[in-house]
Amino acid sequence: QGHLVHMTVVSGSNVTLNISESLPENYKQLTWFYTFDQKIVEWDSRKSKYFESKFKGRVRLDPQSGALYISKVQKEDNSTYIMRVLKKTGNEQEWKIKLQVLDPVPKPVIKIEKIEDMDDNCYLKLSCVIPGESVNYTWYGDKRPFPKELQNSVLETTLMPHNYSRCYTCQVSNSVSSKNGTVCLSPPCTLARS
């Protein structure tokens, strides 16, 4: 009863929800739900019955494997999907798939909060701006990653001449996509003309 699988996909894609094991032999009925009590489709040894739901016209059931195909998934399709099989013996078996649908991340804009020349050192404060998303940030100086502790939406660091970089890149990513934004400086510590 407690098989739970996590799945993360990009919005707009076509998704196959299925289980890793083979279905019980000669089962009597098979049902897919999104959340509890909301049925999407049921197969009962004769035919598939598709119910009125937000998935109507976007789903297809393969009774052989039990796979549920959903086309053009959206963030609103985030849910725990349940596949319930009623066996010929009267027993039921359930599998759960937690589906997370994420939008691709937008291209970030790097905002220069502060650049200051301080006795051959360069104080730098850059912020990586994207509209309200839950993402991971990775900063690179000339393609070399900054240390882990500096990896958030704002890069604040003091650079010494031996570790100046010409270009700074912010990479934003979620589990389905990533995008980069880059700004370049003229040594020692001024914004390069774009």
């Epitope: 019955k49 009623l86 013996t89």
Partner: antibody
Framework: QVRLVESGAEVKKPGASVKVSCKTS????????ITWVRQAPGRGLEWMGW????????DYAQSLQGRVTMTTDTSTSTAYMELRSLRSDDTAMYYC??????????????WGQGTLVTVSS | DIVMTQSPSSVSASVGDRVTITCRAS??????LAWHQQKPGKAPKVLIY???SLHSGVPSRFSGSGSGTEFTLTISSLQPEDFATYYC?????????FGQGTKVEIK
């Protein structure tokens, strides 16, 4: 949450008909069947029949065949049970219950509160 | 029709007791069995289906076992709210039939 709410108590004369409703909410109505069970005063439970809310398929207890009709209205998520040619031994509490599947599985997971039907001259 | 026979027809027990109710089917029904609880003046409520699967929200002190023709409902530690009548029901074939009920009373 899943709810099944039945219509109010009825008093009928022998030979009359009664139609009990069962209004459901909180789930995909067409995805399940509705079973009707009755219980005479001080007695056990008796299965009367089943109707699919998906396509209206029915199965009735042999003893009620010809007197009972079970239907559904998907637009209002309501099931109905009509019993005709009432006799005094039809006096009972009538329950609707949800079958877990759209084709009858015999597993009833939620029950209505019951409708008391009294047949008396 | 499949005849379901419950035993005992009534049992007197105290809070904290372990109570076992047996249900016998007149022919094999695999695991197609449910248990329902009914309190006076109330509608039945399902406790167990598929012989041993607990319905959501039912306390874990209730458990079911058996297959074929012999089935058991066990209440591991009886609580005040468990005093009620319990019915087994076969879901193997039409017409679905119930046992005659077992009344669990306060000793």
């Amino acid at each position: 949450q899943v709810r099944l709410v039945e219509s109010g108590a009825e008093v009928k004369k022998p030979g009359a008909s009664v139609k009990v409703s069962c209004k459901t909410s909180g789930y995909t109505f067409a995805g399940y069947g509705i079973t009707w069970v009755r219980q005479a005063p001080g007695r056990g439970l008796e299965w009367m029949g089943w109707v699919s809310a998906y396509n209206g398929d029915t199965d009735y207890a042999q003893s009620l065949q010809g007197r009972v009709t079970m239907t559904t209205d998907t637009s209002t998520s309501t099931a109905y049970m009509e019993l005709r040619s009432l006799r005094s031994d039809d006096t009972a509490m009538y329950y609707c219950a949800r079958d877990r599947y759209s084709s009858s599985s015999g597993y009833f997971d939620y029950w209505g509160q019951g409708t008391l039907v009294t047949v008396s001259s | 029709d499949i005849v379901m026979t419950q035993s005992p027809s009534s049992v007197s027990a105290s809070v904290g007791d372990r109570v076992t109710i047996t249900c016998r089917a007149s022919q094999g029904i695999s695991s197609w069995l449910a248990w329902h609880q009914q309190k006076p003046g109330k509608a039945p409520k399902v406790l167990i289906y598929a012989a041993s699967s607990l319905h959501s929200g039912v306390p874990s002190r209730f458990s079911g076992s058996g297959s074929g023709t012999e089935f058991t409902l066990t209440i591991s530690s009886l609580q005040p709210e468990d005093f009620a009548t319990y019915y087994c029901q076969q879901a193997n074939t039409f017409p679905y039939t119930f046992g005659q009920g077992t009344k669990v009373e306060i000793k």
